[in-house]
């Protein structure tokens, strides 16, 4: 028995760790799933942040783990990405769905960021150069589409390289290799890590390495 309080909780189940798996919501004392109609990275970002796994990695249209059971609580979830909880996103109404089955249970993959790395290369020091990120064991780059000083500020702060002095595109620090991990990132400049900016998903891009982005931070400029 419970006495008042919010009657909603969120968890990820049957994943590799606490930051991945099938999305389940507890509403009115009952755990249920979320249908994948309209599933998006914005919804995943909200879930990851809510669960203290701030890095949204991907939004599988279905739970890669086993299908859930019980009620399907949410469908057509539409988030802006800045909501504090999944239930602040728009949806069809609690328990309302368009003939979803548990084969359509939504899943997410988040990360606490501990397995991610970032570095600047080919700039002459650790605080300037081409942006490279290590994800899933592979180093890759960031596309310059819509890259701006806010992105650079996040990177410089994250690398403890002071403030952002400038940013560049068009592979100003040479063309990288491997995956292009990010494209069209949206940062407000206050994020604690570049991967906490809004993005369309890891490895989703329409770029080539001629568009690799770079930055120069204040500590790097001092060393030049």
């Amino acid at each position: 028995s419970s006495l008042g309080g919010t009657d909603k909780e969120l968890r990820l189940v049957d994943g590799e760790n606490k930051c991945s798996g099938r999305v389940e919501v507890k509403v009115q004392e009952e755990w249920g799933t979320v249908c994948n109609n309209g599933w998006s990275m914005e919804a995943v970002s909200v879930i990851c942040n809510q669960l203290g796994c701030p890095t949204a990695i991907k939004a599988p249209g279905w739970a890669n783990s086993s299908a859930g059971s019980g009620r399907i609580w949410m469908d057509h979830v539409s988030c802006r990405g800045n909501e504090s909880a999944l239930w602040d996103c728009k949806h069809d109404g609690w328990g309302k769905h368009s003939n979803c089955t548990h084969q359509q249970d939504a899943g997410v993959t988040c990360s606490d960021g501990s397995n991610l790395e970032m570095r600047l290369t080919r700039g002459g020091n650790m605080c300037s150069g081409r942006i490279e990120i290590k994800f899933q064991g592979r180093w890759g780059t960031v596309c310059d589409d819509n890259f701006n000083i806010d992105h650079a500020s996040v990177i410089c702060r994250q690398l403890e390289c002071g403030s952002a002095v400038s940013f560049s595109g068009s592979s100003n620090f040479g063309e990288g290799s491997g995956p292009i991990w990010f494209d069209d990132l949206i940062c407000n400049g206050n994020e604690s890590a570049l991967w906490n900016c809004k993005h369309q998903g890891w490895g989703k891009h329409n770029c080539d390495h001629a568009e690799d982005a770079g930055v120069i931070c204040s500590k790097g400029a001092d060393l030049s």
Epitope: E30, W87, D88, W94
Partner: antibody, heavy 116, light 107 residues
């Protein structure tokens, strides 16, 4: 279709316990839904009191503290509201209400007067 | 508890009028607001759930809107059978709470 029918004593003395019954037809209370009690005071103010889910879990309005208990008898397809130590402030129309999450199905209500 | 403040408390209108009733929550309730209609001697009838979704069988002249803290119930063209008391309620968190009601009367 789900139909709910409240029944109760109509008149109760202060400090006594109140027991109301909701008889459900057309649907099993163990199949689905939350089974709520809501009351409406003179002057129209509505107050959600609590529910018992189809699986038997209860949740109560904290304002009623330890005064309230909601139970059920699955064999009779009924659920119950017990309110201890009633006062004249508990005079109201009591509704049993159900739905998956929303208050979709309402009984017609039973009026309770607390008076000596 | 979340307080739902409804306005106006009473309203006079004529058949054919467009009528708007508002409800304000003391904190954000996302879109988790429902609207009910109650006629004398009857139980409340659900009209709208999740701020803007019409309950089955409810005429399309009823509509709801809003999110966060401010919500509206609109009757586009008032019919004789619409004169009643209307309540909002929040479904966002426990305990569920209701507005004080708006009595819609014939002018």
């Amino acid at each position: 279709d789900v139909q709910l029918q409240e029944s109760g004593p109509g008149l109760v003395k202060p400090s006594q316990s109140l027991s109301l019954t909701c008889t459900v037809t057309g649907y099993s209370i163990t199949s689905d839904y939350a089974w709520n009690w809501i009351r409406q005071f003179p002057g129209n103010k509505l107050e959600w009191m609590g529910y018992i889910t189809y699986s038997g879990i209860t949740n109560y309005n904290p304002s009623l503290k330890s005064q309230i208990s909601i139970t059920r008898d699955t064999s009779k397809n009924q659920f119950f509201l017990q309110l201890n130590s009633v006062t004249t402030e508990d005079t109201a129309t009591y509704y049993c209400v159900s739905g998956t999450y929303y208050f979709d199905y309402w009984g017609q209500g039973t009026t309770l007067t607390v008076s000596s | 508890d979340i307080v739902m403040t409804q306005s106006p408390s009473s309203l006079s209108a004529s058949v054919g009028d467009r009528v708007t009733i508002t409800c304000r929550a003391s904190q954000s309730v996302s879109s988790d607001v429902a609207w009910f209609q109650q006629k004398p001697g009857k139980s409340p009838k659900p009209l709208i759930y999740y701020a803007s979704s019409l309950q089955s069988g409810v005429p399309s002249r009823f509509s709801g809107s809003g999110s966060g803290t401010d919500f509206t119930l609109t009757i586009s063209s008032l019919q004789a059978e619409d004169f009643a008391v209307y309540f909002c309620g929040q479904d966002y968190t426990s305990p569920r709470t209701f507005g004080g009601g708006t009595k819609l009367e014939i002018k």
